[in-house]
C-alpha cells in the first residue's frame, strides 16, 4: 500500500513538475526590465526563450519572435536545448510511468517489469528535473553577468551630454517557475526510484520441480531466493524457473547511467 502511494505520489509530483517545465519554457517572462534605480519609463520590457515583448503603459503589448537561429547567443540556444530535453525526457518518463503504476493492470505484466519501468521513469524524471534546473540556472547566470556589465556601463558611459536609458534585466517569473518545476520533477523521480525497490516481489515462489534420485522418489521444493532489484548484492544467483536455468541478469536488465546521456 505504501509502495503504491509512493509511486502514485511520485507520478503526480512529476506530472506537476513537467507541466511546470513546459509552462516555464513557453513563458515570455524569463527576464524582465529592472525597475530599481532606473528612470521610470512608460514601457516595460521582458524577454523569453522564444520572443521578446514590450508592454506599453497605455495597455498595448507587442511581442516579436527571435526569427533567427544563428544570430542568437549560444547560451540561449543551450538553455532552449536543456529545457526541450527536459520536456522530452519528462514526457517519455510520464508515458512509461503510466504503464508502471501498480494500480493499473495491463495484461499479465509481471511486478518485476513494473519495477523496471518505475525505475526507468524515475531516472528519466530525475534527469528531466536536472535539465530544467540547469537550463534555468544557466539563464540566471547569464542575466547576472549582463546585469553587472550594464550597471558598469551606466556609470562609465556618460561622457557625452546626451544620456541613454540603459535597460537592465532581472529575473523573471519563468525562472522561479522553472526552478520549482525542476525540483518537483526531481523529487517525483526520486520517489519513483524509491517505489521501485518495494515493487519488486520480496519472495518469489517458483513451481515445484521434481528431482528423481535413483531408488528414491523425493520431491524437492527449492526455497525462493530474494529477487534482486539491482540494489541488493544477490545478483548472480542461478535459479531453476519453469524448467529453464537463467541468471537474474538475463531476467532483469537495469538501465545503466549511460542510457540517459
Amino acid at each position: 500500500m505504501a509502495v503504491t502511494a509512493c509511486q502514485g505520489l511520485g507520478f503526480v509530483v512529476s506530472l506537476i513538475g513537467i507541466a511546470g517545465i513546459i509552462a516555464a519554457t513557453c513563458m515570455d517572462q524569463w527576464s524582465t526590465q529592472d525597475l530599481y534605480n532606473n528612470p521610470v519609463t512608460a514601457v516595460f520590457n521582458y524577454q523569453g526563450l522564444w520572443r521578446s515583448c514590450v508592454r506599453e503603459s497605455s495597455g498595448f503589448t507587442e511581442c516579436r519572435g527571435y526569427f533567427t537561429l544563428l544570430g542568437l547567443p549560444a547560451m540561449l540556444q543551450a538553455v532552449r536545448a536543456l529545457m526541450i530535453v527536459g520536456i522530452v525526457l519528462g514526457a517519455i518518463g510520464l508515458l512509461v510511468s503510466i504503464f508502471a503504476l501498480k494500480c493499473i493492470r495491463i495484461g499479465s505484466m509481471e511486478d518485476s517489469a513494473k519495477a523496471n519501468m518505475t525505475l526507468t521513469s524515475g531516472i528519466m524524471f530525475i534527469v528531466s528535473g536536472l535539465c530544467a534546473i540547469a537550463g534555468v540556472s544557466v539563464f540566471a547566470n547569464m542575466l547576472v553577468t549582463n546585469f553587472w556589465m550594464s550597471t558598469a556601463n551606466m556609470y562609465t558611459g556618460m561622457g557625452g551630454m546626451v544620456q541613454t536609458v540603459q535597460t537592465r534585466y532581472t529575473f523573471g517569473a519563468a525562472l522561479f517557475v522553472g526552478w520549482v518545476a525542476g525540483g518537483l520533477t526531481l523529487i517525483g523521480g526520486v520517489m519513483m526510484c524509491i517505489a521501485c525497490r518495494g515493487l519488486a516481489p520480496e519472495e518469489t515462489n517458483y513451481k515445484a520441480v521434481s528431482y528423481h534420485a535413483s531408488g528414491h522418489s523425493v520431491a524437492y521444493k527449492p526455497g525462493g531466493f530474494k529477487a534482486s532489484t539491482g540494489f541488493g548484492s544477490n545478483t548472480k544467483n542461478k535459479k531453476i524457473y519453469d524448467g529453464g536455468a537463467r541468471t537474474e541478469d538475463e531476467v532483469q536488465s537495469y538501465p545503466s547511467k549511460h542510457d540517459y546521456v
Epitope: 526590465q33 528612470p39 521610470v40 519609463t41 512608460a42 514601457v43 520590457n45 521582458y46 524577454q47 521578446s52 515583448c53 514590450v54 506599453e56 503603459s57 497605455s58 495597455g59 498595448f60 507587442e62 516579436r64 546626451v162 544620456q163 541613454t164 536609458v165 535597460t167
Partner: antibody, heavy 117, light 113 residues
C-alpha cells in the same frame, strides 16, 4: 466611438482647490489610461499626469505635491484635483486617452479654468 | 526631467513648400526592447484640441495625410510636410512618451507668408 468630456468650475479663487471630472465612453478605464494636459492662454501644452488602467499614477514633477488623479471605473470617470491654486494655473485643461506608443489619440474638448479673486 | 527642444519656434511658409521642423530630447527616447523611439508629434489648430499626427517617431496615425513624415532616432527627430497646404497652418508639438514626466516641446508655429 471613443469620447472624453471634461467638466470644471470655470472660475476658482486663488489658494482654493480645482476639481475637474473627465467622463469617458467607448473604452474601459480598467484597460486604458487617461492623461491630463493643460494649456495656459497663448502658451504651449503642459503634461500634468496620467492614471493607467491598473490604477497606477504618474505626475509632473513640479506639481507632484499638489496634484492628484483618481478614477471611478464603474462610472467611467476620471478626477483631477489640483490644490493651492495660483493665477498661473489659469489654463484650458484637457483629458486624453493614450493609445499606441503611449501617444494620446483621443482628446476631450477641454475645459477653461480661470484662477482669479 | 527630459527637456524637449523644438526649433524653429515659428516658421513662415508658402503653400506647396516643403516644411521641416526639428525636435531634440535631452535623453534618448529609443527603447532597446523593440527598437522604437517613443516620440510623438501633435498638431493643434487655433481654438481646437490637439490632434495626434505621428507616434513611435515615424508611424502615421490613421487618417493623417501622407504628406506628413516623421523621422529620427535617439535624441534628434524631424517632422516634414512634403507640400504645405493651407489647412496645415497650426502649432506642432513633439512629446516624450518614454520617460516620466512625459514632457512636451514648446511647439513650432506655422504661419502663411
Amino acid at each position: 466611438q471613443v469620447q472624453l468630456k471634461e467638466s470644471g468650475p470655470g472660475l476658482v479663487a486663488p489658494s482654493q482647490s480645482l476639481s475637474i471630472t473627465c467622463t469617458v465612453s467607448g473604452f474601459a478605464l480598467t484597460t486604458y489610461g487617461v492623461s491630463w494636459v493643460r494649456q495656459p492662454p497663448g502658451k504651449g501644452l503642459e503634461w500634468l499626469g496620467v492614471i493607467w488602467g491598473d490604477g497606477s499614477t504618474h505626475y509632473h514633477s513640479a506639481l507632484i505635491s499638489r496634484l492628484s488623479i483618481r478614477k471611478d471605473n464603474s462610472k467611467s470617470q476620471v478626477f483631477l484635483k489640483l490644490n493651492s491654486l495660483q493665477t498661473d494655473d489659469t489654463a484650458t485643461y484637457y483629458c486624453a486617452k493614450p493609445g499606441r506608443g503611449n501617444a494620446m489619440d483621443y482628446w476631450g474638448q477641454g475645459t477653461s479654468v480661470t484662477v482669479s479673486s | 526631467d527630459i527637456v524637449m527642444s523644438q526649433s524653429p519656434s515659428s516658421l513662415t511658409v508658402t503653400a506647396g513648400e516643403k516644411v521641416t521642423m526639428s525636435c531634440k530630447s535631452s535623453q534618448s527616447l529609443l527603447n532597446s526592447g523593440n527598437q522604437k523611439n517613443y516620440l510623438t508629434w501633435y498638431q493643434q489648430k487655433p481654438g481646437q484640441s490637439p490632434k495626434l499626427l505621428i507616434y513611435w517617431a515615424s508611424t502615421r496615425e490613421s487618417g493623417v495625410p501622407d504628406r506628413f513624415t516623421g523621422s529620427g532616432s535617439g535624441t534628434d527627430f524631424t517632422l516634414t510636410i512634403s507640400s504645405m497646404q493651407a489647412e496645415d497652418l497650426a502649432v506642432y508639438y513633439c512629446q516624450n512618451d518614454y520617460i516620466y514626466p512625459l514632457t512636451f516641446g514648446a511647439g513650432t508655429m506655422l504661419e502663411l507668408k
